[in-house]
């Protein structure tokens, strides 16, 4: 209730995640013209990214383009990107939508289509659609601990939301053990009232907020954190000009002297922690 | 139907030479590749020949003695192999791919192959 009486002031605060976590993926290989399962594990070094500020990011689903050379190859014949002569194909140019820099020629790029030929990582990235389920779709068992230090200047006072009495075997629940400070992903998403499983796909942003709302008078002190969940991201795939969350990343290495890469299109769930609050004191 | 016929494939002495050609027929090609099998080794790229600017990629076994050329005219490719070793025994065979260029055979294209045996 709001104590009139009091003197606020907002929140400062800084976080800290941690998350564990481990995948078994099960995929199609191609290796010398035949298809095969491929299993690999995939543990916390492979699927979290350090991001900037309060937010992490769990890598659900991906799409490789592997064993791309810096040469001249035709580019990918997406929507509007086929010719049937040079003169479709302008030497020099950079179509934000191509993969590479053009060098005039129109040339096969199968059997039936001819594309502009293209200076750039060859061959280039083809327009695949997201695997359905998403490769990593266990990750919904992963757990963060979410470290949360708070810190109010003008009353002099410090605290974090993890307590020296928590089991750190514990797991949130909004009932039974609020004030646990490691979430497992699949419940964040159950209590933001989103399907991980169908999230997962196409990736997106989930918000974690952490309120603060502190009573810092000595006889009725209370100053801990109280936890809720929203979808960030706009969740109408079908509606949304580019669904979801992903971003592009690539795996340097040498094969015979030629330096090659492996693109990987990570889909993913981004996490942002939205400390919030305020502390009053009389 | 997309072919790809090779031929000029013989018996030869160490030393000596033998020119391969390549002729395709029922599409236009880009890329494409000479490879060799030995018996009980694995196919391995030889050369590569870009048909848009003529480049060419030849791997170090047979750097400085073996030559790609093109007539575009014909829709053939030629490999010219001279000093010729022993260890150059093989069936060597032509595709649309490229591996040391990173050009998959989308279209295909693959030939049956002609031997070539070196003797010492």
């Known amino acids: 209730s709001d104590k009139l009486y009091q003197r606020k002031e907002p929140v400062i605060s800084s976080v800290h995640t941690k998350v564990k976590g481990i995948a078994e993926v099960t995929e199609n290989v191609t290796e010398g013209g035949v298809t095969k399962l491929g299993h690999s594990i995939f543990d916390t070094a492979d699927y979290t990214f350090p991001l900037q500020g309060n937010s992490f990011f769990v890598m659900t689903n991906y799409v490789k383009s592997e064993g791309q050379v810096q040469t001249l190859c035709p580019e990918y014949p997406r929507r509007g990107a086929q010719c049937s002569s040079d003169r479709r194909c302008k030497k020099g140019w950079m179509d934000p939508q191509s993969k590479g820099i053009q060098t005039g020629r129109c040339v096969p790029y199968d059997k039936t289509r001819k594309t502009c030929e293209v200076s750039a990582w060859c061959p280039t990235e083809e327009e695949k659609e997201a695997p359905r389920p998403a490769l990593l779709r266990s990750a919904e068992n992963f757990t963060v601990l979410i470290k949360n230090n708070i810190h109010f200047p003008g009353h002099n006072y410090t605290t974090r939301n993890i307590l020296p009495t928590m089991n750190g075997s514990c797991t949130f629940h909004k009932t039974w053990d609020p004030q646990c400070s490691i979430f497992r992903l699949g419940d964040i998403f159950q209590e933001a009232g989103e399907n991980f499983t169908e999230v997962a796909v196409q990736g997106g942003i989930m918000g974690i907020e952490i309120y603060w709302d502190c009573n810092l008078d000595s006889w009725s002190h209370h100053c801990r954190p109280r936890y809720s969940f929203r979808r960030l991201d706009d969740k109408n795939t079908d509606e949304s000009f580019v669904p979801g969350y992903n971003f592009r990343y690539a795996k340097y290495y040498k094969e015979n002297n030629v330096e090659k890469r492996t693109l990987i299109k990570a889909f993913g769930i981004r996490f942002d922690i939205l400390v919030f609050g305020t502390g009053g004191k009389f | 139907e997309v072919q790809l016929v090779e031929s000029g494939g013989g018996l030869v002495q160490s030393g000596g030479s033998l020119r391969l050609s390549c002729a395709g027929s029922g599409f236009s090609y880009y890329i494409i590749g000479w490879f060799r099998q030995a018996p009980g080794k694995e196919r391995e790229e030889v050369s590569c020949?870009?048909?848009?600017?003529?480049?060419?990629y030849h791997t170090n076994s047979v750097k400085g003695r073996f030559t790609m050329s093109r007539d575009n005219a014909e829709n053939t490719v030629y490999l010219q192999m001279n000093s010729l070793k022993p260890e150059d025994t093989a069936v060597y065979s032509c595709a649309t791919e490229c591996q040391r260029w990173a050009y998959p055979n989308r279209i295909g294209a693959r030939g049956q192959g002609t031997q070539v045996t070196v003797s010492s």
């Open positions: 020949i870009r048909v848009t600017d003529g480049s060419t």
